[in-house]
């Protein structure tokens, strides 16, 4: 299709080489009142089209995205050619940063209902640059945490070094929806609730003498509880003796609950005590069996191919640790009678 009639928007993505970062493009098809370019023939305000503009409905889930190759080749369907770019409804998600994402992206409705809809499309010229060292050292992260129940704020990474007074007007989106009343480079959250979690996008306009473009940054906001003040507790085994049958295989499970920590480095391991000797056992990897906002339950098993007489003289110890401290639970094997 002919893209010369598409409206054009220029965007800049300045990414940090230090952190993982995502980016999004919205299919900003015009609303009915702004949609004079959704028609093959541009209309003056006094002219009235015979057909309603395409975007009569707010359902933007059915759009098609293309990339325009720089060599003038035909448009490429994003979904077929770019595995690191994902389409979710009307939003295009770039999962990895890099200058190779620079280019022209076109979106238009899948359903063309009338000849007037042919040029109902948006062309986004995306320029991607790595952040220069000259940029501010303490810019806000693209991953920000909000502590549940407390106050907090969400900062626009590309503007976080500027004072509120210097900052240009910012347009914020949350999960693709416009937050029309938020206009500063920092959103103040009076009290953090779980619904504050999500993907926030901040846009502001920069211009020079020739043209203007939108500078965009994406912030992943996570709502968290405060770091635990407790060491992990062992949920299983509970008993310190276990009845076993000699010669049979045996699996002993150690399940431990770890409270939330922002920097989470849980340790769960098994070791064996035999008189004065003590050694760590090579056992299968630990696995998370339940994860909530407040805590995580991790399990690690010790597997004996067959229980021997020697095993009855040993103690099997599960050791768990977080940044606060450690807990142990030992199990003595006892032969089953009868």
């Amino acid at each position: 299709f002919n893209i010369s009639g598409c409206s054009t928007k220029k965007l800049l993505w300045t990414y940090s080489t230090r952190s993982e970062e995502e980016f999004v493009l919205f299919c900003d098809l015009p609303e009915p009142q702004k949609s004079h370019f959704c028609h093959r023939n541009r209309l003056s305000p006094k002219q009235v089209p015979e057909h309603l503009p395409f975007m009569g409905s707010n359902d933007l889930s059915d759009v098609q995205w293309y990339q325009q190759p720089s060599n003038g080749d035909p448009l490429e369907d994003i979904r077929k050619s770019y595995p690191h770019i994902i389409q979710d409804k009307c939003t295009l998600h770039f999962l990895t940063p890099g200058v190779n994402n620079s280019g022209s992206y076109i979106c238009r409705p899948k359903m063309i209902k009338s000849p007037y809809d042919v040029a109902c499309c948006v062309k986004m010229i995306l320029e991607v640059k790595p952040q220069t060292n000259a940029s501010c050292e303490y810019s806000a992260s693209h991953k920000q945490d909000l502590l549940l129940g407390s106050t907090g704020s969400i900062s626009c990474p590309s503007l976080s070094c500027q004072s509120d007074a210097q900052s240009p007007a910012v347009t914020w989106y949350k999960n693709g929806k416009l937050l029309s009343v938020e206009r500063s480079n920092r959103i103040v959250v009076d009290e953090v609730y779980d619904y504050h979690q999500g993907t926030y996008v901040c846009d502001y306009t920069q211009s020079d003498t020739v043209s203007s473009w939108t500078v965009r940054a994406v912030v992943q906001v996570r709502t968290i509880v405060g770091d635990t003040k407790l060491k992990p507790d062992i949920l299983d085994p509970v008993e310190d003796t276990l009845e076993v049958e000699l010669g049979k295989p045996l699996t002993i499970s150690c399940k431990a609950r770890f409270g939330f920590e922002r920097v989470f480095n849980p340790v769960i391991k098994w070791y064996i005590k035999d008189s004065d000797l003590e050694w760590e056992v090579s056992v299968p990897e630990a696995k998370s069996i339940k994860s909530t906002l407040k805590d995580e339950i991790i399990e690690r098993n010790i597997i004996l191919e067959k229980v021997t007489q020697r095993d009855l003289r040993r103690k099997f110890v599960c050791f768990v640790q977080n940044s606060i401290g450690n807990t142990t639970q030992s199990v003595q094997l006892k032969e089953k009678r009868g």
Partner: antibody, heavy 118, light 111 residues
Framework: SLEESGGGLVQPEGSLTLTCTAS?????????MCWVRQAPGKGLEWIAC????????TYYASWAKYRFTISKISSTTVTLQMTSLTAADTATYFC????????????WGPGTLVTVSS | AYDMTQTPSSVSAAVGGTVTINCQAS??????LAWYQQKPGQPPKLLIY???SLASGVSSRFGGSTSGTEYTLTISDLECADAATYYC?????????????FGGGTEVVVK
């Protein structure tokens, strides 16, 4: 309960400060304390809110931003300062508190009448 | 803040009947919507919060529902005491749960 005071007759272009006093609870808990007005025979019109938690955030209707100022004076008192008043500001002014669970104004004062006239 | 458009401005129905009042938000506010009842000379009373949850002490004859940016208050089995003006209100502002803009109101007349 909530009680508004400070209403009365004021000259056009004059100023007035309304006070909302809470009893039975204090703003040491976190609430949105707000002002709403209702012109005679007309609908409800939101004016402003203040968050009584640590951020102290204030929120204004676009038309109220430059003439009206909401403030928390103490743990039981919120005020609304109004300047450059005109006849269009004649209304009953209500103080209201949001409900922490049932989001919306769960508690209202009886209202105070402000008349702007020469 | 947001613009809330309420329709109709007035509606009348017989005792035992049903009344439906609509409210349209200028942009998406999710479930952040409240409904109030106001009788002459009194402050408003909260009926519904979070678009469809009944405020404490409110009769189950009042119900709220939502579809996109359209919100509906339904009063069934109408009683004389339901004669009042009803208002919708957005209870969200940006990212904070601030009760702000009201709809224009709907007068309910019970015959």
């Amino acid at each position: 309960s909530l009680e508004e005071s400070g209403g009365g007759l004021v000259q056009p272009e004059g100023s007035l400060t309304l006070t909302c006093t809470a009893s039975g609870f204090s703003f040491n808990s976190k609430y949105y304390m707000c002002w709403v007005r209702q012109a005679p025979g007309k609908g409800l019109e939101w004016i402003a809110c203040i968050y009584t938690g640590t951020t102290g955030s204030t929120y204004y209707a676009s038309w109220a931003k430059y003439r009206f100022t909401i403030s928390k004076i103490s743990s039981t008192t919120v005020t609304l300062q109004m300047t450059s008043l005109t006849a269009a500001d004649t209304a009953t002014y209500f103080c209201a508190r949001d409900d922490r669970v049932e989001h919306g104004y769960g508690l209202w004062g009886p209202g105070t009448l402000v008349t702007v006239s020469s | 803040a947001y613009d809330m458009t309420q329709t109709p401005s007035s509606v009348s129905a017989a005792v035992g009947g049903t009344v439906t009042i609509n409210c349209q938000a200028s942009e998406s506010i999710g479930s952040w919507l409240a409904w109030y009842q106001q009788k002459p000379g009194q402050p408003p009373k909260l009926l519904i919060y979070s678009a469809s949850s009944l405020a404490s002490g409110v009769s189950s004859r009042f119900g709220g529902s939502t579809s996109g940016t359209e919100y509906t208050l339904t009063i069934s089995d109408l009683e004389c005491a339901d004669a009042a003006t009803y208002y919708c209100q957005s209870t969200f502002y940006g990212v904070n749960p601030v009760p702000t803009a009201f709809g224009g109101g709907t007068e309910v007349v019970v015959k």
